[in-house]
Amino acid sequence: QSSERRVVAHMPGDIIIGALFSVHHQPTVDKVHERKCGAVREQYGIQRVEAMLHTLERINSDPTLLPNITLGCEIRDSCWHSAVALEQSIEFIRDSLISSEEEEGLVRCVDGSSSSFRSKKPIVGVIGPGSSSVAIQVQNLLQLFNIPQIAYSATSMDLSDKTLFKYFMRVVPSDAQQARAMVDIVKRYNWTYVSAVHTEGNYGESGMEAFKDMSAKEGICIAHSYKIYSNAGEQSFDKLLKKLTSHLPKARVVACFCEGMTVRGLLMAMRRLGLAGEFLLLGSDGWADRYDVTDGYQREAVGGITIKLQSPDVKWFDDYYLKLRPETNHRNPWFQEFWQHRFQCRLEGFPQENSKYNKTCNSSLTLKTHHVQDSKMGFVINAIYSMAYGLHNMQMSLCPGYAGLCDAMKPIDGRKLLESLMKTNFTGVSGDTILFDENGDSPGRYEIMNFKEMGKDYFDYINVGSWDNGELKMDDDEVWSKKSNIIRSVCSEPCEKGQIKVIRKGEVSCCWTCTPCKENEYVFDEYTCKACQLGSWPTDDLTGCDLIPVQYLRWGDPEP
């Protein structure tokens, strides 16, 4: 999977929707220059490809939605990497340009003769990609050509700015909301001193910026803030972990506004350095309840509290997906590669046979084994439906009383489609209302997850709360079996009576040493001792001064 030859999944139709999914992991640091992608992904890749193909089948067989119009698609692999996604987006654009030139009769062969060649249909809109950084790059290109983009998991706050990203919309909320949710969790458990880590790139950077701003307003201190690339090498992760340990035992909580693979890198480093149980990770929705993040490193992840976008499993997707087999699934060009990777065997005799596996896949293999649906499946499907409803509303207004594509709709005008999409309002796959605000954002509801040891060597994510519209609800008993088990993450303990906080130069406001006031001083505020005026003395609680009662000495009084 390198830059020379990219695989594409096609489904024919009257209108073609583009999609960018991370079918493969991003290139490792040493392979970035050749844009050589990593291993195939199931949840973020294959499942999303299949969701697109099957959702379009459902839309096309729904007589009430886009009657007499067939939706098709062109699915490309973003590899969760900007350079790859841009390269793929250029292919989408190229299709559009060739098609529009053809409409104007501009297609000419090299020798100057006219061409009877029918090019591919233009892409009217794009679903995805998943990553915010990648989505920004793709949007910068797509908006030049008025191609609307609907994201299913790009949550960066920057994308709300319509002056910069006019053709961008999303069926997920902005990260400002989950940053607030994370701060609310930190506040709830009185963690006033935490370390912070974020993934290099827009998602992590803007999310962590919001977390830090909100934390400061709430009196929460950040011991230190670190950033790291998701595809950083072992050494980089080890170095980061060593830095985090330098803030122990005070900053035990690590707030991680991270992509899932960054969290995995941290867990792996914890294993290498023997640091399991030293930290409590508070993770953003990049981690959520993903098993591909914790697999093999459950001990290191135990106790982790994560934010997950609320999205129930989609039953009809599983009914379709779990029946798929490599010998019959020919429309997904990555499926055979995935099957071999998933079951660690080779599809002997097939063109995509992977000889790195010795064992031949047998016919009893099934996707039902250890199946986990992509946690963002509902959003992926809602994004596809949004595009369909937007096109449907556009058809209704441009082609009244006409079933199918009328001339007024040909070729599809991206500006009009965007207008129509922004007004879209329908019931989503989980029964929730899908609509877009003036920034193209959707409202947000989160679930709070806790990664726990459920039994001997059995670990799982448990729903321990929710955050909805600014209100945090947590089942504290589920997270902490006893109050005394609540982890402490504070820099300094409160000062005793008659002591003030002395903050050393260059230290954050949550770290202090407690110093007692002098004998004649009282605690004026938490940082200042003040001497009592002549004739007065500190009160017993040392919070003020009382006048010293005047005592007159008489002859005969004993010496004091």
Epitope: E327, N358, S363
Partner: antibody
Framework: QRQLEESGGGLVKPGGALTLTCKAS?????????ICWVRQAPGKGLEWIAC???????TYYATWAEGRFTSSKTSSTTVTLQMTSLTAADTATYFC?????????????WGQGTLVTVSS | DIVMTQTPASVEAAVGGTVTIKCQAS??????LAWYQQKPGQPPKLLIY???TLESGVPSRFKGSGSGTEFTLTISDLECADAATYYC???????????FGGGTEVVVK
């Protein structure tokens, strides 16, 4: 000298059972090899029965052989084929052969075969 | 049902001549075809696998071609030692099974 040798053939009554053994010498059935069973009725052509992956003992059978024939790896140099409910149609020379897959690479090492006769 | 149809059943050619044997798969099998030579009282010997790859030690006079459902084995510069029965073996990846052709007897005059 790398070779495979089959044993266990002989005369068996209809409805009876028999276990054939394939023993390797000069090689062991290391994890990337497949040991397959092929039979040939007297004067007739070849017929594929089954394969076993030496790595973990996963088996692959011809549809007609499923249930009646069972292949297992009993050591690093031996594989067996258990045959039950035998009929006259099962009379044949049984070969074991080694390949790099169930079939797409062919079988590059064969035993001399062992004759099984099913008769009352 | 999966079947490998091999033709002809028997062919006769002179020393130095050329023989062509055809094999047809009942289903698309990509390049999953092997050719064997078997002499009386001996086990089969692998000549070609993956439709056209010559097994080591096999003379280049043996040539395999074809893909999908139609395959051919060509033996040129026939020698007396080439007199034998030749079998094709098709591997059907979609059902993970094998089938052999009925065999072709080559007689060298």
């Amino acid at each position: 000298q790398r070779q495979l040798e089959e044993s266990g053939g002989g005369l068996v009554k209809p409805g009876g059972a028999l276990t054939l053994t394939c023993k390797a010498s000069g090689i062991d059935f290391s994890s990337y090899y497949y040991i397959c069973w092929v039979r040939q009725a007297p004067g007739k052509g070849l017929e594929w029965i089954a394969c076993i992956y030496a790595g973990d003992g996963t088996t692959y059978y011809a549809t007609w052989a499923e249930g009646r024939f069972t292949s297992s790896k009993t050591s690093s140099t031996t594989v067996t084929l258990q045959m039950t409910s035998l009929t006259a149609a099962d009379t044949a020379t049984y070969f074991c052969a080694r390949g790099s897959g169930v079939g797409s690479y062919g079988y590059n090492l064969w035993g001399q075969g062992t004759l099984v006769t099913v008769s009352s | 049902d999966i079947v490998m149809t091999q033709t002809p059943a028997s062919v006769e050619a002179a020393v130095g001549g050329t023989v062509t044997i055809k094999c047809q798969a009942s289903e698309y099998i990509y390049s999953n075809l092997a050719w064997y030579q078997q002499k009386p009282g001996q086990p089969p010997k692998l000549l070609i696998y993956r439709a056209s790859t010559l097994e080591s030690g096999v003379p280049s006079r043996f040539k395999g071609s074809g893909s999908g459902t139609e395959f051919t084995l060509t033996i040129s510069d026939l020698e007396c030692a080439d007199a034998a029965t030749y079998y094709c073996q098709g591997y059907f990846p979609s059902i993970i099974t094998n089938a052999f052709g009925g065999g072709t007897e080559v007689v060298v005059k």
